[in-house]
Interface confidence: low
């Protein structure tokens, strides 16, 4: 740091004094010296460094009417809302010709209540779930004592006893609230006062218990809730982009998700109106009157195939003698499922209904018992799946053939 | 390749606890379910539960609720099967058998231990 | 909880045999019918899931069909090997249950 030479009598005949007061206090130090000829710009050092950004004022007052004169420069520099980096000592330094001078110190101090540098946050938290608080303060003075205090009730004899910056609640079973008083010998000051509400715990072992083409019957089991009965549970059922799209972390679906409530108990619900033999993700949450849970983890499922809702569409069935041409058209009801071919089931007045499996053809040409004189003969055809045959379509005559 | 490892042979007296290991190897544990399963000497298979080896979550079949306990050591790709209080109705084989995909246990069970045998006797 | 019956519970057949096991439920399962192979050393295998899926590794002369409540495995040209029991197995709903077993021995 700088010093003043020996040499020369120092010009400095005001000193810096000294400041002590809490936070947010507001304070000017000043220093005067006297100097021959034209006045030099003074300048702060805090703790032996220069204040580049002093707020510092300087006003120069001449003692005669000649520049060379004596003169007067008082410089004062102000300190607004006091911070524990304002602490230290402050001199004034000048320079003058070649030699530098320093003015005797004044100190700044900061003394007062505690002050706050992390106060306890307001948060939601599973029931019987544990959980860190925390709340950390200065002075000076130290040492800075912490008391908690749960619901207006302190966790400890007297501050300093008991947690201190950091504490471990192992589990709340109704929403409460927490702050921490800080003590030194100024006094005690008290942190905000944190709400930690308590939310059901996330549901557990999401699951199906039976599945139909176009319905799941899911369960699973609620988790603990507190003081708090469970009001409803809410389940959210969205379409597999192509069953991988859904990671066990992403947070939200490709798309809109189908959204249905569950009064509980029981925990389990029937989600209707779903597409057959196509894969879903499910997730649940369950509410208290303080809030719902978080979601589970989302659970791939996927729907079981079904039989056609409908018959194969425009039968035609036309007969030359003993040989009857059928063709038809795939049903137009949903199929619910991978389409696996088709069943004809043909039959005369007075003769057993005779069976076939077509395949995925959608025509056959039949050859008739005999010389094709078995009157009334009738065709049906029914589409099916992997889980079964769709309806049958009504009769359909067979009529000779006419050419054309 | 995919494998199911159980530990040996227990031969525990009336009242005595045993716990059976299951060490799995050859696919990613957490990502499947473990069932556990009893035989009994000529007899058929008994559905005991099945522990979400992502969660930690057990579930239990109404006849294993109580005395039975399902557990993990994740880290190990382990399963283990307690049981407490043992009894000489317990004297049978317990399998393990790999199962559901996370918490979805409605999957064939594609993998079997080897079996673990507990005789029981004063 | 959901029965699973196997009537037949042993039955004898020669090399060569094409032979039938059946399972029945005591309600509709939705086609989530699993078919298990116990050697008489003890181990289990999966053959079948899902009616009629095979599982990896299963020969083809495993097959498996039915519907709703009635299912079958067959075993199409009977080896030495396949003498064990068979376990019919319903995942369609908790708790799981097996059928009692079809122990299949060489005439």
């Known amino acids: 740091a700088p010093r003043g030479t020996q040499a020369e009598e120092s010009p400095f005949v005001g000193n810096p004094g000294n400041i002590t007061g809490a936070r947010g206090l507001t304070g000017t130090l000043r220093c005067q010296l006297q100097v021959q000829g034209e006045p030099p710009e003074v300048h702060w050092l805090r703790d032996g460094q220069i204040l580049e950004l002093a707020d510092s004022t300087q006003t120069q007052v001449p003692l005669g009417e000649d520049e060379q004169d004596d003169w007067i420069v008082v410089s004062q520099l102000r300190i607004t809302s006091l911070q524990l980096s304002d602490t230290g000592q402050y001199q004034c330094l000048v320079f003058l010709g070649h030699q530098t001078f320093v003015s005797q110190p004044g100190y700044v101090g900061l003394e007062g209540l505690p002050y706050f540098l992390e106060e306890p946050e307001d948060r939601t938290v599973a029931a019987n779930t544990p959980f860190n608080l925390s709340c950390q303060a200065q002075g000076p003075p130290e040492p800075v004592d912490l008391l908690w205090l749960q619901d207006a009730v302190p966790l400890a004899t007297a501050p300093g006893h008991g947690p201190q910056r950091s504490l471990h609640v192992p589990g709340l079973n109704k929403t409460s609230s927490f702050s921490c008083e800080a003590h030194n010998a100024k006094g005690v000051t008290t942190s905000r006062t944190a709400t930690i509400t308590v939310l059901p715990q996330q549901p557990r072992n999401l699951h199906l218990v039976s599945r139909q083409p176009t319905e799941l019957e899911v369960a699973w089991t609620p988790g603990l809730s507190g003081i708090y009965p469970l009001t409803h549970c809410t389940l959210q059922a969205v379409l597999s982009d192509d069953g991988m799209g859904i990671q066990a972390g992403e947070p939200d679906p490709p798309e809109e998700p189908l959204t249905s409530q569950a009064s509980v108990p029981p925990h389990q619900l029937r989600l209707g109106s779903l597409h057959p033999h196509t894969p879903y993700h499910i997730r649940v949450a369950c509410t208290s009157s303080q809030g719902p849970s978080s979601w589970t983890h989302w659970l791939p499922v996927e729907t079981p195939e079904g039989v056609p809702l409908g018959p194969p569409e425009n039968i035609s069935a036309t007969r030359n003698g003993s040989q009857a041409f059928v063709h038809w058209q795939e049903p137009r009801a949903p199929l619910q499922g991978t389409l696996l071919g088709y069943r004809l089931a043909y039959q005369g007045q007075d003769t057993p209904e005779v069976l076939m499996d077509i395949g995925l053809r959608q025509e056959v040409t039949l050859e008739l018992q005999g010389d094709g004189s078995v009157s009334n003969l009738t065709v049906c055809v029914a589409a099916y799946t992997a889980a079964g045959d769709g309806p049958w379509s009504l009769p359909v005559p067979l009529e000779a053939w006419r050419p054309g | 390749q995919i494998q199911l490892v159980q530990s040996g042979p227990e031969l525990k007296k009336p009242g005595e606890t045993v716990k059976i290991s299951c060490k799995a190897s050859?696919?990613?544990?957490?990502?499947?379910?473990m069932n556990w399963v009893k035989q009994a000497p000529g007899k058929g298979l008994k559905w005991m539960g099945w522990?979400?080896?992502?969660?930690?979550?057990?579930t239990y079949a109404d006849d294993f609720k109580g005395r039975f306990a399902f557990s993990l050591e994740t880290s190990a790709s382990t399963a283990y099967l307690q049981i407490n209080n043992l009894t000489t109705e317990d004297m049978v084989t317990y399998f393990c058998?790999?199962?559901?995909?996370?918490?979805?246990?409605?999957?064939?069970?594609?993998?079997w231990g080897q079996g673990t045998s507990v005789t029981v006797s004063s | 909880d959901i029965q699973m019956t196997q009537t037949t519970s042993s039955l004898s057949a020669s090399l060569g045999d094409r032979v039938t096991i059946s399972c029945r439920a005591s309600q509709d399962i939705n086609n989530y019918l699993n078919w298990y192979q116990q050697k008489p050393d003890g181990t289990v295998k999966l053959l079948i899931y899902?009616?009629?899926r095979l599982h990896s590794g299963v020969p083809s002369r495993f097959s498996g069909s039915g519907s709703g409540t009635d299912y079958s495995l067959t075993i199409s040209n009977l080896e030495l090997e396949d003498v064990a029991t068979y376990f019919c197995q319903q995942g369609n709903t908790l708790p799981f249950t097996f059928g009692s077993g079809t122990k299949l021995e060489i005439k």
């Open positions: 058998a790999k199962g559901g995909y996370y918490s979805n246990p409605i999957y064939p069970m594609d993998y």
């Open positions: 050859g696919y990613t544990f957490t990502k499947y379910g």
């Open positions: 522990i979400n080896t992502y969660t930690g979550e057990p």
């Open positions: 899902y009616i009629s």
